[in-house]
Structures are given as structure tokens and as C-alpha cells.
Interface confidence: medium
């Protein structure tokens, strides 16, 4: 019943995006935008786990907006959309769009912070600290305990960021966190602290330096 009567290439997939963001705090109004590569007659929004379309929009342009008002954590999940044209056969829809993960939360999960290759380094050597969350496209900040402002900021496409610490000022205790790159900002918990020390320095704590 649902097999298109022409090759799937005839029904190219749309693109689904979220505004203001795909990660938001509860109570925010979120707009999911389904954009087709050609003018469409009808758009359908689907949520993973539900076999019914969540919403339909009848339009005669390339995009449809689906409004989710004052979202709650329960509205988080995986969304995708499809579109169809009047001249397609009955029941023929486009291929599904990209999957959009909507996360509605007051606080993002705590990231991990690890040293590469390890937390004990040769004096004067560089060390890379990887702050890893579970969500791509976040802004990451690295802190040194005892220093109020972040040492480094990185906007990352991946769900992690690698901070390079150079040379003699490396030893100390570090932590990191991440947040959404734009408003409305959602922040993670801080990572567990990570102690970086020079080889042979024992458990000497350098956190008061600089």
C-alpha cells in the first residue's frame, strides 16, 4: 500500500530544523521547520514511537512550520518530516527527512573530562584534555580550579572538544562544562575534577598557581 509508484529519487527528502534550537529549557516555544527541495502540497511531522503523524500542514510552498508551544520534557524525542505533492499517487510521500533530536531539559548531562595520553605528563610537555558530552554542536569551556574565568572556549561540531594545554603551566586541577551555542542557553553540570601532574611530582597540588 505504501510503495511509491516511481523511483525514490523522484521524492527527495526534506530537511527538518528547530528554532530557536534543538536543545531548550522547558516552557520555550519551539518551531520545527520542514523544508522541501520543491514546492509541496502537504507536510507531515512524525515523532519516533508514534505511528500516527503528529501534525499535518497544508501549504503550497517549500516549507512548513510546526509550532510546539511551551514545550515539556515529554515532548523531547526524535522527529522527522515528509511532504507530498498533489500530482503524486494516493499515499505517495517523500522519503523521510533527517532525524531531529529535540531535547527539553533544565540541565544537560555532566560531561567527562580525560587527559590524552594521560593525567601524568613529562615536565614541560603539552597535554590534551578532552571534554566529552553526548550532544553534538555545543560550546565547551575549560576551567582551572581556583581561576574564575574559563581558560579556553571551543565551539564544537562533535559531542566533544579537545583543549590543548601547553608546557610548564599544565599541572593543576581542571573541570569543564558545555552549553547550547545560542539562547535560550542550557548549561550542563560541571565535569568531575581532573588532576594533571608532572611525572615525579607525586600528588603535589598546583591549583593555587597563576
Amino acid at each position: 500500500d505504501f510503495t511509491p509508484t516511481a523511483p525514490l529519487a523522484s521524492y527527495p527528502q526534506p530537511w527538518l530544523g528547530a528554532h530557536p534550537a534543538a536543545v531548550v529549557t522547558p516552557g520555550i516555544n519551539v518551531t520545527l521547520t520542514c523544508r522541501a527541495p520543491q514546492s509541496a502540497w502537504r507536510f507531515a511531522l512524525f515523532k519516533s514511537g508514534l505511528v500516527t503523524p503528529l501534525l499535518l500542514r497544508d501549504v503550497s510552498v517549500e516549507l512548513a512550520e510546526f509550532f510546539l508551544e511551551e514545550v515539556t520534557p515529554a515532548q523531547g524525542g526524535s522527529y522527522h518530516c515528509r511532504y507530498r505533492k498533489t500530482d503524486w499517487g494516493p499515499g505517495v510521500w517523500s522519503q523521510p527527512s533527517n532525524v531531529l533530536e529535540l531535547l527539553v531539559t533544565d540541565q544537560l548531562p555532566r560531561p567527562s573530562l580525560v587527559a590524552l595520553p594521560g593525567p601524568v605528563v613529562a615536565p614541560g610537555a603539552n597535554v590534551s584534555l578532552r571534554c566529552a558530552g553526548r550532544i553534538p554542536g555545543m560550546s565547551f569551556a575549560l576551567y582551572r580550579v581556583g581561576v574564575a574565568t574559563p581558560l579556553q572556549y571551543i565551539d564544537s561540531v562533535q559531542p566533544w572538544a579537545d583543549f590543548l594545554l601547553i608546557g610548564t603551566h599544565t599541572p593543576g586541577t581542571y573541570c569543564c562544562y558545555y552549553h547550547t551555542p545560542s539562547a535560550p542557553y542550557v548549561l550542563s553540570q560541571r565535569s568531575q575534577p581532573l588532576v594533571i601532574s608532572f611525572e615525579g611530582s607525586g600528588s603535589l597540588d598546583y591549583t593555587q598557581g597563576n
Partner: antibody, heavy 118, light 109 residues
Amino acid sequence: EVQLLESGGGLVQPGGSLRLSCAASGFTFSDYYWTWVRQAPGKGLEWVSGSPVFGAANYAQNFQGRFTISRDNSKNTLYLQMNSLRAEDTAVYYCAKAGFTGGHFDIWGQGTLVTVSS
Amino acid sequence: QSVLTQPPSASGTPGQRVTISCSGSSSNIGNNYVSWYQQLPGTAPKLLIYGNSNRPSGVPNRFSGSKSGTSASLAISGLRSEDEADYYCQSYDSSSWLFGGGTKLTVLG
């Protein structure tokens, strides 16, 4: 006007087969999830099967294998093929259309009575 | 035996407020929407509440729905004789729709 009209019910012997139809009018049939729900005499509602906009049909456990749901989008019609019928399948069978907020059934047909008896 | 549990009967006098409960689990009500249906004698069910607390157009605001955790309830205020009917809750669980066993509401006097 939105309307659902079931047909195909009647008296059938145990072990027999029956095919129910549900003709829809007043909206774009192919855009919706369609379902069959039944109600045995004096009993409650029981979901039987559903036909999604995309993908495979789904069934309540009791009906998997014996019942087959299908749809003809060009005819705006939903079907239920019922095989190996038993006395306990005696019920009014309703077809219904699902809404868009996660699984309510907003429009129902008037129902068709299936009686399985020798 | 229904997965969603409703009291088999409820009653009230005209003008009263009556509440019907529906109890499920985290895999159905806890994680999905709840709907309520009214079935008058000899007729097909009619959607009364969807998405936990929304009323379709044409349903009087005397009917209201709510959900908390793994339970839901339907409240009918200003009870009328025409409200005498069977009421069913419904939710969703891994590609299956579930109905409660139904509650027969009797309007006394």
C-alpha cells in the same frame, strides 16, 4: 462531511472467514492512520489492528496471524480480512481514524456486527 | 483483563461532580497521551478528551481530563441525565493502543 461507513458483517460459522470494509469520505484518506476496534456484546472496547501512513500494519497480539488489515488509498477504503473465526470473535467492529497528537481516534464509523455461530 | 484499570461503575446526582480514574504503568500512561471516550447505549464511541486534557470542538467544558504519573482521570462537573453512558480511557504502548475496561456512569434521581 466526514463519514465512515463499515460493511461486510454478518453471520459466519466457526472456522470461516469474513472481510470487512470501511469506506471513508470527506478527507484525504491516505494521510491518516486507520484502525479497527471491536466490542463484544456487553463488553468493553478492544483495539484490533492499525494501518499507518507509512510502514507495516500493527496488530494486537490476539489477532496477529488470523486477521489482516489493508487499505486502498485510491478507493478511500480500509479492510479487515478475518480468518479462522471463533465464537469469541462475535462483536461489533468499528473502523476509526486517528488524530495527530499521539493516538486518539477522533472519527468512528457506526460499526458492523459479526456473529460467529454454528 | 484490561491493562488500563477503571472502576466498573460510578454514579452521581444531577449537578454533582464525578471523577473516573484510569490507572496504567510507565510504559503506557506514564510515557504517552491519554484519551477518553463516551459511549451512549447503542451508539459508537465518541472522543471526549485527547492529549490528556484537550477537548475536541463540540464537547462541553463540563468534561475535563488530567494526568499524573501513571494515572489519569476524567472529571464531569454539573452532571446531567444525558451523561449516563459508558466511559473508556485509552493510551498507547509500543505500537498498540490500550483501552480501559470501561466505567458505567449512572445519573441518579
